[in-house]
Amino acid sequence: KLTIESTPFNVAEGKEVLLLVHNLPQHLFGYSWYKGERVDGNRQIIGYVIGTQQATPGPAYSGREIIYPNASLLIQNIIQNDTGFYTLHVIKSDLVNEEATGQFRVYPELPKPSISSNNSKPVEDKDAVAFTCEPETQDATYLWWVNNQSLPVSPRLQLSNGNRTLTLFNVTRNDTASYKCETQNPVSARRSDSVILNVLYGPDAPTISPLNTSYRSGENLNLSCHAASNPPAQYSWFVNGTFQQSTQELFIPNITVNNSGSYTCQAHNSDTGLNRTTVTTITVYAEPPKPFITSNNSNPVEDEDAVALTCEPEIQNTTYLWWVNNQSLPVSPRLQLSNDNRTLTLLSVTRNDVGPYECGIQNELSVDHSDPVILNVLYGPDDPTISPSYTYYRPGVNLSLSCHAASNPPAQYSWLIDGNIQQHTQELFISNITEKNSGLYTCQANNSASGHSRTTVKTITVSAELPKPSISSNNSKPVEDKDAVAFTCEPEAQNTTYLWWVNGQSLPVSPRLQLSNGNRTLTLFNVTRNDARAYVCGIQNSVSANRSDPVTLDVLYGPDTPIISPPDSSYLSGANLNLSCHSASNPSPQYSWRINGIPQQHTQVLFIAKITPNNNGTYACFVSNLATGRNNSIVKSITVSASGTSPGLSA
């Protein structure tokens, strides 16, 4: 069927349109275009004879039309009058005619709109504003945008006049926004420039900052006032009702108690004619004295004396505060506060109670701190330590022993050998020792202030022969793939070589094995169950050698994925089901069973006599090792078939 398509259907003035012909018949003589919905010679635009390829203008030809051999008609420089229907008359060779009608519409290109307003300075909560989109244009649609968003739904917003007018009732400061209007028709859309609505509002109740109302004598008072307002507010200050100044800030240096009173800020908006005030009450306090601490015992003895610290001066109706090591007081039965908190008593002082201690007096504004006080706690001497830790020495070397004991004041030292006093020094030195220098070496530490003494005895053996060593371990039960173990060969001896064996073999090369501390320490990183072996250490010098007893490492591991045996999964009805679960684990795992998810027993073996098809299902064995914190499980499906119906196994 012959049809006409307009491309485009909506045409802008000045542009062009193509009336495109579809399904043109074969064997044509010619065709004619007419303005309107029917063939009318008076309204012929153009005719076309195919044989001669001759186009002949008609009465309605405007000079802007071009006809194409395929019968399509191009109209250029479109004007408003071109809107309407166009009819194509086709004359076939057999002189049978066909007609088709198409149409298009012509619209003007819209100008850029602008917004007019009936009120350039509306007052908040009082005025309404009507925005109108100019110019008024026929067949145009009007749209509005607020801050580049489409209009919000609000009972205070109303569109009228075919959406050309936007009215804001009872404007608020939040209506201060960018407004745009847009005109649209089928061929164009244009947006106006922004119009910013300037809403007059305020002043709101002013806020005075800072918020604190308590000040200390001698400080500066600096108050600032702010009230939301458009245009910005004008400010005035009043003190106790008396006008001071017309500024936003009020500054009074070096205030005294006499500056206490009520401070009023007044905000005024000349455009709205409104005033608002806020009052704050300022209190100025006299400066309190700086506190200090007195002590009833300046040199207390550890674990014997108590110390009472008192915060001075005594002031009525005052709160006293205490700090130790810049922290508030810890909860301790050895710390006691008096009823008024002014005295802090330390019962049975220790060396850790040195402080520093601070007390504070709290007034309405702040806390005044005392200078810190440090206690001189007399303590010790503790048990002295003798270094180095060697106990075996070879003849001919020098023996140099040093003694140290924690003590305040520092300890005085004495050395005794086999009970006989030697010297009053911290270090003992004997050159070129022999077997005769073997014996008991005693260091005595004395604190002259507390009168306490402590001793440590060390057995020194001077011998070419080495003792039998022993192995100490930092972890007797390491967890597999998690822990490390450090074995140390004892004792520490001078000029000695340390050796290690595992299961009677020298140490294997492994990145998990590390020797340190002069080979005296053997560390196993990330232990595995295979490390549960016999470890032996040996010591040797140029004269002798000796080996320790073996130490076996107890590695905690597992549980590994359990195995259920027998492996059969098919049983005949009437057979006994006897399932055994096993998982490698140290310590042995706790076993438990579930049948079809229901907990059963906590045994390694699950036995069910004379099973039936009702015993079909999933049999799960769960294993747990609390020492490693690990769990594991396995599920087995069991099928029980009626006797004689299955090639399955019978248990």
Partner: antibody
Framework: QVQLVQSGAEVKKPGASVKVSCKAS????????LHWVRQAPGQGLEWIGY????????NYSQKFQGRVTMTRDTSTSTVYMELSSLRSEDTAVYYC?????????????WGQGTLVTVSS | DIQMTQSPSSLSASVGDRVTITCRAS??????LAWYQQKPGKVPKLLIY???NLVEGVPSRFSGSGSGTDFTLTISSLQPEDVATYYC?????????FGQGTKVEIK
Amino acid sequence: QVQLVQSGAEVKKPGASVKVSCKASGYIFTSYWLHWVRQAPGQGLEWIGYITPNTGYTNYSQKFQGRVTMTRDTSTSTVYMELSSLRSEDTAVYYCAREYGNYNYPLDYWGQGTLVTVSS
Amino acid sequence: DIQMTQSPSSLSASVGDRVTITCRASENIYGYLAWYQQKPGKVPKLLIYNAKNLVEGVPSRFSGSGSGTDFTLTISSLQPEDVATYYCQHHYGTPYTFGQGTKVEIK
């Protein structure tokens, strides 16, 4: 239901032996391990050892090693605990108790106890 | 052998009170700890195993906690029927050892 029924009270002279029985019922005898625990008058609980009924394996406390023997009879689901060389401090109530499972579990069912009095 | 130390050895509390008994092992027993209740003239009854697992049928006012060496049995609201001696026991390998017991009475 699970039950452990022990033999009756015994009075023995110092140096003698005593054999206490514990008959199990209400569960599969060979699946659970059985322990012996004693309690002297007014005192706490003291573990003696255990037996695994399926294999007859025993594990005794070092304190009773050499004096205690635990056996089992699977045909009657009974375990026995024999203590020899009795002395007065062996006077106690002797309990058999079933382990809640196998390996590192506590004791969930206890016999009613057997009072053994050692007196000259 | 692993030693088990219970505290207190006895306590007296009112009905409805929260009661706590502690048990300390001489070495790490991980979570292998059980609590028993023994009423006068009766056999011990298992309450809790693996430090915190409540045995079926035991009232929920009983609870256990802890791991390593320090463990606690808590009775959230003491009832008259809870008068008994309570024992802790480690079940980490043999020999099994028990605490010396805590006697709980009603005020």
